[in-house]
């Protein structure tokens, strides 16, 4: 049965969604304001954002007394969304105050701003490394869901109607579907990854969904009003169930499993794709792009960053 990893503001927790006695285990406690959370399953690493400390942090599972490490501690204000590229070994995040979407290595180095224009309230971010795409929600003045290459290419709005507060976002990697939860319109919808063939999953009976994830045939989401985690069938919306209640303040949620992070080989594995700094996955051939930290230019060879990186 799936393990759910979730941020609870003052801590990050785990709960076995299929357990008989539904009690959560604390992964890391004593936090200020944990908001977004993700993981790298192969290394047992957990990453989270803290919107009060204005930082991205990391620890390891199954390591007694594992230390909390700072990953990014400057230039953040309200990092509301976080996603781990488990294939390219990168972190992607949104910041709704700097109005940026950024990427960096898992240790926070070689940090690059991918998007800084036409963002208002970017929130959730989700990755499909197999196809080189990233997706994010924006619940600002013109609410929408957007898609772009994980290298910052081919940005496109894919959902911009019947949408208001799109808080939660997750990808069904197997069935190639996008799911999102809207806190204002009280629904969970799904669509193809280009935004087409939109369908209702749950409508009208949600209070204030914030984050969304899935495993197998089941969707899981956190709700701010009920302060709990809920589940339902991902196709029909049926089999509704409360997984865990009386939480302090549930925020982001992920299913902690290998199935959510299937491995495959990319050109970035071989000598970092020949890139001196960032090797970012891309939706178009050769399916990767060399990139440089913000403020540093790429040389004409398309692989090496100019001096100063």
């Amino acid at each position: 049965s799936p393990l759910l990893l979730f941020a609870n503001r003052r801590d990050v927790r785990l709960v076995d969604a299929g357990g008989v006695k539904l009690e959560s285990t604390i992964v890391v406690s004593g936090l200020e304001d944990a908001a977004a959370v993700d993981f790298q399953f192969s290394k047992g690493a957990v990453y989270w954002t803290d919107v009060s400390e204005e930082a991205i942090k990391q620890t390891y599972l199954n390591q007694t007394g594992a230390a909390v490490q700072n990953v990014v501690i400057s230039g953040l204000v309200s990092p509301d969304g976080l996603a781990c590229d488990w294939v390219g070994k990168k972190l992607y995040w949104t910041d709704s105050e700097t109005n940026r979407i950024e990427v960096a290595n898992l240790n926070g180095t070689s940090r690059k701003v991918l998007f800084w224009q036409d963002l208002d309230q970017p929130r959730a971010i989700a990755l499909d490394p197999a196809h080189g795409y990233m997706y994010w929600t924006d619940w600002g003045e013109t609410p929408r869901i957007e898609r772009a290459g994980m290298d910052g290419s081919t940005r496109k709005i894919i959902v911009d109607s019947d949408i208001y507060w799109p808080n939660g976002l997750t990808i069904d990697l197997e069935e190639q579907k996008l799911y999102w939860a809207d806190a204002k319109l009280s629904f969970i919808h799904r669509a193809n990854l280009d935004g087409s063939f939109r369908q209702k999953v749950v409508e009208g009976s949600l209070t204030h969904p914030f984050a969304l994830t899935l495993s197998g045939d089941t969707l899981y989401w956190t709700d701010w009003q009920t302060r709990s985690i809920h589940a339902c069938n991902k196709r029909t919306g049926g089999k509704r169930k409360e997984i865990l209640s009386a939480l302090y303040s549930p925020m982001d949620i992920q299913v902690l499993s290998q199935e959510r992070q299937p491995f495959f080989h990319t050109r970035c594995e071989e000598d970092n794709g020949g890139c001196s700094h960032l090797c970012l996955l891309s939706p178009s051939e050769p399916f990767y792009t060399c990139a440089c930290p913000t403020g540093v230019q790429l040389q004409d060879n398309g692989r090496t960053c100019k001096a100063g990186a």
């Epitope: 919107v51 009060s52 105050e97 309230q121 701010w224």
Partner: nanobody, 123 residues
Framework: AVQLVESGGGLVQPGGSLRLSCAAS????????VGWFRQAPGKEREFVAA????????YYADSVKGRFTISRDNSKNTVYLQMNSLRPEDTAVYYC????????????????WGQGTLVTVSS
């Protein structure tokens, strides 16, 4: 935790002005997004305006745009709401609210709020 105290309410004639203040205790006030909400008799509490922690962005309800201005002075742990061209329909109890999570405050789910100050617009 932060404690919020509103002041500056009162009786004013239509077309007049008032400045509301929201004073906060707590030295980390600058890490909070702060908003003003109001509740008229017999109505639901509604969003009026908000300002992000850095003061980099402000937000207003359509009904007050161009008339109300929100600002903050983090050195004084205070957020202000300057209300001009007041109308009878602005009559309400005005509440100050704060949350470290901007997304929460702007989606009307805030951690802290004050007791409110009454604004009456009448001739």
């Amino acid at each position: 935790a932060v404690q919020l105290v509103e002041s500056g309410g009162g009786l004013v004639q239509p077309g007049g002005s008032l400045r509301l203040s929201c004073a906060a205790s707590g030295r980390t006030f600058s890490t909070y997004t702060v908003g003003w909400f109001r509740q008229a008799p017999g109505k639901e509490r509604e969003f009026v305006a908000a300002i992000r922690r850095r003061g980099s962005s402000t937000y207003y309800a359509d009904s007050v745009k161009g008339r109300f201005t929100i600002s903050r002075d983090n050195s004084k742990n205070t957020v202000y709401l300057q209300m001009n061209s007041l109308r009878p329909e602005d009559t309400a109890v005005y509440y100050c609210a704060a949350d470290t999570r901007t997304v929460a405050l702007l989606q009307y789910r805030y951690d802290y709020w004050g007791q409110g100050t009454l604004v009456t617009v009448s001739s």
